[in-house]
């Protein structure tokens, strides 16, 4: 796995431990919490990042608690089970043997059950809406400039193939970035839209996951784009199923 050779760090994930013990003395980095080797030339999966976040000391974790307006994980931050590829396992269980099924971004999509609960497959979140509200500016941003800048950001910073940024909508002060990626469209090596959205969300909150890079400095034609708050809508290929009992107030 590639990593910065000179000081053996992982440019795409600061929640790692790196050492030159790879083949031929190459730098190898492992995610905190899971100890899994990560590919530092691309984004680390959200599952491994959440696991690393949960492994951080409690006092360090308070530093990265979501802000009042941020989208929090549905049942609070939890310590997920990740598969050998670093993806969320379809079934997640807590220490008291309460289990539930999640989608590919780790959001619960079934009622909670016991250890007998079956989650046949990891349902893909194929469509992500990122709604941003920017701080007041002298005038509205030019839509095409804004579109180009956000597409560039996802391409260059998050290494997301441009075809997965379906649209950038703008109605001042709301910006909506639409990411779309069906199972059939995602090739080996493609960054997952869920991972890109998670990195972006953390960047926007000033909690960058990148090693040693400055925080996100978004500018449209030199004008700073300051995000007031973010909402992320996750939409699955297969609709979630809940019992009516779950819906009872």
């Amino acid at each position: 796995h590639t990593a910065a050779q000179d000081n053996c760090t992982c440019p795409t994930n600061k929640m790692t431990v790196c050492s030159p013990d790879g083949p031929g003395g190459r730098c190898q980095c492992r995610a905190l919490g899971s100890g899994m080797a990560v590919d530092c030339s691309t984004l680390t999966s959200k599952c491994l990042l959440l696991k690393a976040r949960m492994s951080a000391p409690k006092n360090a974790r308070t530093l990265v608690r979501p802000s009042e307006h941020a989208l929090v994980d549905n049942d609070g931050l939890y310590d997920p089970d990740c598969d050998p590829e670093g993806r969320f396992k379809a079934r997640q269980c807590n220490q008291t043997s309460v289990c539930w099924c999640v989608n590919s971004v780790g959001v619960r999509r079934t009622d909670k059950g016991d250890l007998s609960l079956r989650c046949d497959e990891l349902v893909r979140t194929h469509h992500i809406l990122i709604d941003l509200r920017h701080r007041p500016t002298a005038g509205a941003f030019n839509h095409s400039d804004l579109d180009a800048e956000l597409r560039r950001l996802f391409r260059e910073r998050y290494r997301l193939h441009p075809k997965f940024v379906a649209a950038v909508h703008y109605e001042q002060p709301t910006i909506q970035i639409e990411l779309r990626q069906n199972t059939s469209q995602k090739a080996a090596g493609d960054v997952d839209i869920g991972d890109a959205a998670y990195y972006f969300e953390r960047d926007i909150k000033g909690e960058s996951l990148f090693q040693g890079r400055g925080g996100l400095d978004l500018r449209v034609r030199g004008e700073p784009l300051q995000v007031e708050r973010t909402l992320i809508y996750y939409l699955d290929e297969i609709p979630p199923k809940f019992s009516m009992k779950r819906l009872t107030a």
Epitope: H127, L129, D131, H169, L231, Y233, L235
Partner: antibody, heavy 122, light 111 residues
Framework: EVQLLESGGGVVQPGMSLRVSCAAS????????MHWVRQAPGKGLEWVGI????????YYGDSVQGRFTISRDNSENTLHLQMNSLRAEDTAVYYC???????????????WGQGTLVTVSS | QSVLTQPPSVSGAPGQRVTISCTGS?????????VHWYQQLPGTAPKLLIY???NRPSGVPDRFSGSKSGTSASLAITGLQADDEGDYYC???????????FGGGTKLTVL
């Protein structure tokens, strides 16, 4: 002025199909996600589903998933709701509604039509 | 059986202030999703009253205001008028259901 005019409601037997439509005017229809919301007699509002501004994506409420289909014709400024395998509990006033902002899809509703009554009864 | 919980009814005398609560959970209001409020006067279609928790569309009097905290939201109506009588619904988005969700509605009676 935004206008949304539903049509096609009526009485239908359980198990049958019905298509209701909504004619939109007063705004750039192709820029807005559109919703259907229903209200059973004397009951509250229930979301039926949304269709993206370009028609590429549709999402539905749990109770109609697999039976109802939302479509749109942006050249005709028309929204449709195809209802199959109708049940007595589908009896409601069906409202066509426009997303508040011209994003691809927006889960907040701005303007509403006056509704069309669909009665499912044998 | 609504995802968002509202009191079935509230009432107040003309000129008074009333509030309507809307309680959700960690997958809707508590997850940061916005709350919107709709007014449905007798025999008419719903009308947007408050959007994004606190904002009023043009034409809605400033007697109507919204707030949100944690997993709940509230609609406040001051200077109650007879023609405010009707049903009021809160609405949000639920990430577990992948769906837009409504409260069960609150009937406002002006005494």
């Amino acid at each position: 002025e935004v206008q949304l005019l539903e049509s096609g409601g009526g009485v239908v037997q359980p198990g049958m199909s019905l298509r209701v439509s909504c004619a939109a005017s007063g705004f750039t229809f192709s820029n807005y996600g559109m919703h259907w919301v229903r209200q059973a007699p004397g009951k509250g509002l229930e979301w039926v589903g949304i269709i993206w501004s370009d028609g590429t994506y549709t999402y539905y409420g749990d109770s109609v998933q697999g039976r109802f289909t939302i479509s749109r014709d942006n050249s005709e400024n028309t929204l449709h709701l195809q209802m199959n395998s109708l049940r007595a509990e589908d009896t409601a006033v069906y409202y066509c509604a426009k997303s508040l902002t011209p994003l691809g899809g927006s889960f907040r509703i701005g303007d509403w039509g006056q509704g069309t009554l669909v009665t499912v009864s044998s | 059986q609504s995802v968002l919980t509202q009191p079935p009814s509230v009432s107040g005398a003309p000129g008074q202030r009333v509030t309507i609560s809307c309680t959700g959970s960690s997958s809707n209001i508590g997850a940061g999703y916005d709350v919107h409020w709709y007014q449905q006067l007798p025999g008419t279609a719903p009308k947007l009253l408050i959007y994004d928790n606190t904002n009023r569309p043009s034409g809605v009097p400033d007697r109507f205001s919204g707030s949100k905290s944690g997993t709940s939201a509230s609609l406040a109506i001051t200077g109650l008028q007879a023609d405010d009588e009707g049903d009021y619904y809160c609405q949000s988005y639920d990430s577990r259901l992948n769906a837009l969700v409504f409260g069960g509605g609150t009937k406002l009676t002006v005494l």
